[in-house]
């Protein structure tokens, strides 16, 4: 079953996916696609990296994090209802049957017409149920899927502001994390 993420029409959606490079700059190919992960790569590819750089992307889809450090989380800009569905993050790890595949379900909700509340700057207060533990094995993942009522765009925005802080690391640790090497 896919882990579910939510965003509102007109906002940016955030789909977390991480791995830990064996060494700094020792990257592996990663692809993102619309649709469940097939045997090879990703179906309907929207973004792809190689061992050095992002080598393919389509409009509205980008990596906001530092992919050279293994943050390959996908941001989808200005989402519409048509962006709903399953997305595949595939980390193409060399070796026998080592690829890591994550199917993430994006649910787009109609935009609220009520005025936006004042943004809370206190991370713990804003997200009291945020997971902050890190998995300990390559097959173990912890995601935001158990937090269906959290606005992921809000998380993404806040994470960008706090990217270099410990709290941003806590957010990162709640995503799909894979260690290599």
């Amino acid at each position: 079953s896919e882990v579910e993420y939510r965003a509102e029409v007109g906002q940016n959606a955030y789909l977390p996916c991480f791995y830990t490079p064996a060494a700094p700059g020792n990257l592996v190919p990663v692809c993102w696609g619309k649709g469940a992960c097939p045997v090879f790569e990703c179906g309907n590819v929207v973004l792809r990296t190689d061992e050095r750089d992002v080598n393919y992307w389509t409009s509205r889809y980008w990596l906001n994090g530092d992919f050279r450090k293994g943050d390959v989380s996908l941001t989808i800009e200005n989402v519409t209802l048509a962006d709903s569905g399953i997305y595949c993050c595939r980390i193409q790890i060399p070796g026998i049957m080592n690829d890591e595949k994550f199917n993430l379900k994006l649910v787009i909700k109609p935009a609220k017409v009520t005025p936006a509340p004042t943004r809370q700057r206190d991370f713990t207060a804003a997200f009291p149920r945020m997971l902050t533990t890190r998995g300990h094995g390559p097959a173990e993942t912890q995601t935001l899927g158990s937090l269906p009522d959290i606005n992921l765009t809000q998380i993404s925005t806040l994470a960008n502001e706090l990217r270099d802080s410990r709290l941003a690391n806590d957010l990162r640790d709640s995503g799909a994390t894979i260690r290599i090497g």
């Epitope: 469940a36 045997v39 590819v45 060399p94 070796g95 080592n98």
Partner: antibody
């Protein structure tokens, strides 16, 4: 256009190792986006995917054969190979090498295949 | 593994007729389904990939449809060179698996 040329013995004794090689021309075996595969077809029967090795080094073997299969690439010779150990008569089949090229626009057309090699396992 | 079941096993038709071949997966393969044609002594040739996309150089009389578990290959008007064995193949889950084939023979 990529072309695949297979080579290897057509007769292998039981318990020995079947070895086949596929030489790639018209392209580099280390080019991004390619998946180099082996498929077999038992006489008068359907097709069975043995496994593949990708440009990125990912390797997948059919679970039914995993313990006996090795697929490897020799970039210096622009070749990839199949080794199947401890063969029995049930491994008698036509063996094909094939490649899938991942094209961002068109998907996965498996339209490059070797000519096929009939391998008979018999003493 | 995903089991692919094709029907009928044999289909006897005349040139100019319409052929409809079916393929059913034991679980959903989304649209990750391909159709191949194989003639005696030859390697399989890709006709359709991702359920409905014609491969390069494949005539328009070949079309594919379906998603999930049920798929169809249609040949709108049979040509003499179309009589062969047809296989469906899924690439949704490893291992990649094929159907047992449908033999299309001249009536």
């Amino acid at each position: 256009q990529v072309q695949l040329q297979q080579s290897g013995p057509g007769l292998v004794k039981p318990s020995q190792t079947l070895s086949l090689t596929c030489t790639v021309s018209g392209g580099s075996i280390s080019s991004g986006g390619y998946y180099w595969s082996w498929i077999r077809q038992h006489p008068g029967k359907g097709l069975e995917w043995i496994g593949y090795i990708s440009y990125s080094g990912s390797i997948y073997y059919n679970p039914s054969l995993k313990s006996r299969v090795t697929i490897s690439v020799d970039t210096s010779k622009n070749q990839f190979s199949l080794k199947l150990s401890s063969v029995t008569a049930t491994d008698t089949a036509v063996y094909y090498c094939a490649t899938a090229y991942y094209d961002l626009l068109t998907g996965y057309p498996f339209d490059y295949w070797g000519q096929g090699t009939l391998v008979t396992v018999s003493s | 593994e995903i089991v692919m079941t094709q029907s009928p096993a044999t289909l006897s038709l005349s040139p100019g007729e319409r052929a409809t071949l079916s393929c059913r997966a034991s679980q959903s393969v989304s649209s990750y389904l391909a159709w191949y044609q194989q003639k005696p002594g030859q390697a399989p040739r890709l006709l359709i990939y991702d359920a409905s996309n014609r491969a390069t150089g494949i005539p328009a009389r070949f079309s594919g449809s379906g998603s999930g578990t049920d798929f169809t290959l249609t040949i709108s008007s049979l040509e003499p060179e179309d009589f062969a064995v047809y296989y469906c193949q899924q690439r949704s889950n490893w291992p990649i698996t094929f159907g047992q084939g449908t033999r299309l023979e001249i009536k």
